[in-house]
């Protein structure tokens, strides 16, 4: 989130009475964590365990298939984006445990908290690419038969990653460490100094490109896809609808608190009560957004179980079925054999 957003423990409200208990030594630190911070820690721990193991498994399953299966390319890239973000979690976890003290230096401050934003943009752009792929399979099957290949898929992914990196640069550039004199603490956050307009611009761009525009375009895209599949009475279209809704909805649900608080904070004075309240919730909003980094493997497994009846196969085998099934370009079948790859859309959910 923007502006110096990491809160300290409660040091009491400094009132203006010049009182000092001369016999009581004063602690310079507080041992109690706020409830939102405790919740954030729990979420971070779960996301780290599920995200690292789940996405590593997805990468392992899809990496072997990526040469020949386009769906595997999509899922591989989404899993890599999620996996990378999860690697920052131990550091973020440690910082919250230490009341947001940041002993890791300036470079780590610029890079690690920016990973979740890189993940957000990479995921949403990859999901947009996947959605375009789904759209073309349904509406331009002949074009797909002629041009849809692994090479083009990799180029599309590279473009998505490149754009994601570009969109993450503002957050990266404005992240700084600030050392507070008392209580003694080093903080990592975003500082726009006097430039409130720039802060608002970054927050608005993030909201529009990372949330509102994808929400609009993907809603329209899947409305068309689902209308077409229903009109053709494609088999398992209800199942497709469920997966699509799960995938797309999870992205927007988990990013919503972060985006709303981010845009609000950019328009508020840093000393205002509302700003300070939102700042206390910041870690929780970030952790909630981080759920996107571990939800994809869960959706794949749940969907896989659904399609297999019940879990009779090993996890890698089940995931392989879900993630590496190639789409048949004949329109009527495009949702029959590859229903599950629409789950890819989900991973846009970072």
């Amino acid at each position: 989130m923007d502006s110096f957003n990491y809160t300290t423990p409660d040091y009491g409200h400094y009132d203006d009475k010049d009182t000092l208990d001369l016999n009581t030594p004063v602690d310079k630190t507080s041992n109690t964590l706020r409830v939102p911070d405790i919740l954030a820690l729990v979420i971070f721990a779960v996301v780290f365990l599920v995200g690292v193991l789940g996405n590593a498994l997805v990468v392992w399953v899809t990496a072997f298939e990526a040469k020949r299966t386009i769906n595997a390319i999509w899922f591989l890239n989404l899993a890599v984006a999620d996996f990378l973000s999860c690697l920052a979690l131990p550091i973020l976890f440690t910082s919250i445990v230490q009341h947001h003290h940041w002993p890791f230096g300036g470079a780590a401050c610029s890079i690690l908290p920016s990973l979740i934003l890189l993940n957000m943009y990479a995921s949403i752009l990859l999901l947009a690419t996947i959605s375009a792929d789904r759209f073309l399979l349904v509406f331009k099957p002949i074009w797909c038969q002629n041009f849809r290949g692994a090479g083009l898929a990799w180029i599309a992914c590279a473009v998505a990653w490149g754009l994601a990196l570009l969109l993450t640069i503002p957050s990266f550039l404005y992240r700084v460490v600030r050392e507070e004199y008392f209580p003694p603490k080093v903080l990592c956050g975003v500082d726009y100094s006097h430039d409130k307009r720039r802060e608002r611009a970054v927050a608005i761009v993030r909201l529009v490109l990372g949330f509102l525009w994808p929400l609009l375009t993907l809603t329209i895209c899947y409305t068309f896809i689902l209308l077409r599949t229903w009109s053709r009475r494609a088999t398992r279209s209800t199942k497709t609808l469920k997966v699509v809704v799960a995938v797309v909805a999870s992205f927007f649900i988990f990013w919503l608190p972060y985006q709303v608080t981010g845009i609000m904070m950019s328009f508020l004075e840093p000393s205002s009560p509302t700003f300070l309240l939102l700042k206390k919730l910041d870690s929780l909003c970030v952790s909630f957004a981080y759920i996107n980094c571990c939800i994809n493997p869960i959706i794949y497994v749940v969907a896989g179980q659904g399609f297999q009846g019940r879990l009779r196969k090993s996890l890698p085998s089940l995931l392989r079925n879900v993630l590496t099934e190639e789409s048949v370009v004949r329109e009527s079948k495009s949702f029959t054999r590859s229903t599950v790859d629409t789950m890819a859309q989900k991973t846009q959910a970072v």
Partner: antibody, heavy 123, light 112 residues
Framework: QVQLQQSGPELVKPGASVKISCKAS????????MNWVKQRPGKGLEWIGR????????KYNGKFKGKATLTADKSSSTAYMQLSSLTSEDSAVYFC????????????????WGQGTTLTVSS | DVLMTQTPLSLPVSLGDQASISCRSS???????????LEWYLQKPGQSPKLLIY???NRFSGVPDRFSGSGSGTDFTLKISRVEAEDLGVYYC?????????FGGGTKLEIK
């Protein structure tokens, strides 16, 4: 009544070292931080660093790292600042300043200043 | 480091007039706990500085109520409602929010 009594003026040669003292009274010495501030004519005020007499923890302005060394003696309620490798740039008035924070973090300010120690570096 | 810029450098006033000194920080000095540690000091010739205002607007004990502080974020002001002879000297703003704490360049309040 809080008082900070600093040592007298010093005249030293370039390259030498000097140790300035600041004796505190009227409050519990280990319950407040002691800061040091430099004032040169026409150059304003500069924060050098601070020491927590309770645990000896120090924090320096990057500009004065290697130049100033802060210490404190709880038994005599005295803070010290040693300045080394002196040059004419170090000629200034040096103040010790109490940083106050009350129990439960009530209040927060640099409230009491010593009378200042004039350091002249000259050959 | 946070640069504290004071204006004006010199402020000639008549006794009984209102005086206003401005201080601007190069970055926000609002701490993560919401507090802003901005102080004002008066230094008379041959003396050490004396604390007047702390935390932007709170008068230190014994400071007359003609002194008042205001501001937020990066812009702060010290006002003296009716200047008296004992108010003459150099006024410094100071931020104690971030390391290293820094002082403004000073404003000399003098008789016209």
């Amino acid at each position: 009544q809080v008082q900070l009594q600093q040592s007298g003026p010093e005249l030293v040669k370039p390259g030498a070292s000097v140790k300035i003292s600041c004796k505190a009274s009227g409050y519990v010495f280990s319950n407040s931080w002691m800061n040091w501030v430099k004032q040169r004519p026409g150059k304003g005020l500069e924060w050098i660093g601070r020491i927590d007499p309770g645990d000896g923890d120090t924090k320096y302005n990057g500009k004065f790292k290697g130049k100033a060394t802060l210490t404190a003696d709880k038994s005599s309620s005295t803070a010290y600042m040693q300045l080394s490798s002196l040059t004419s740039e170090d000629s200034a008035v040096y103040f010790c300043v109490r940083f106050y924070y009350g129990s439960n973090y009530v209040g927060y300010y640099f409230d009491y200043w010593g009378q200042g120690t004039t350091l002249t570096v000259s050959s | 480091d946070v640069l504290m810029t004071q204006t004006p450098l010199s402020l000639p006033v008549s006794l009984g007039d209102q005086a206003s000194i401005s201080c601007r920080s190069s970055q926000s000095i609002v701490q993560s706990n919401g507090n802003t540690y901005l102080e004002w000091y008066l230094q008379k010739p041959g003396q050490s500085p004396k604390l007047l205002i702390y935390k932007v607007s709170n008068r230190f004990s014994g400071v007359p109520d003609r002194f008042s502080g205001s501001g937020s974020g990066t812009d702060f002001t010290l006002k003296i409602s009716r200047v008296e002879a004992e108010d003459l000297g150099v006024y410094y703003c100071f931020q104690g929010s971030l390391v290293p704490p820094t002082f403004g360049g000073g404003t000399k309040l003098e008789i016209k």
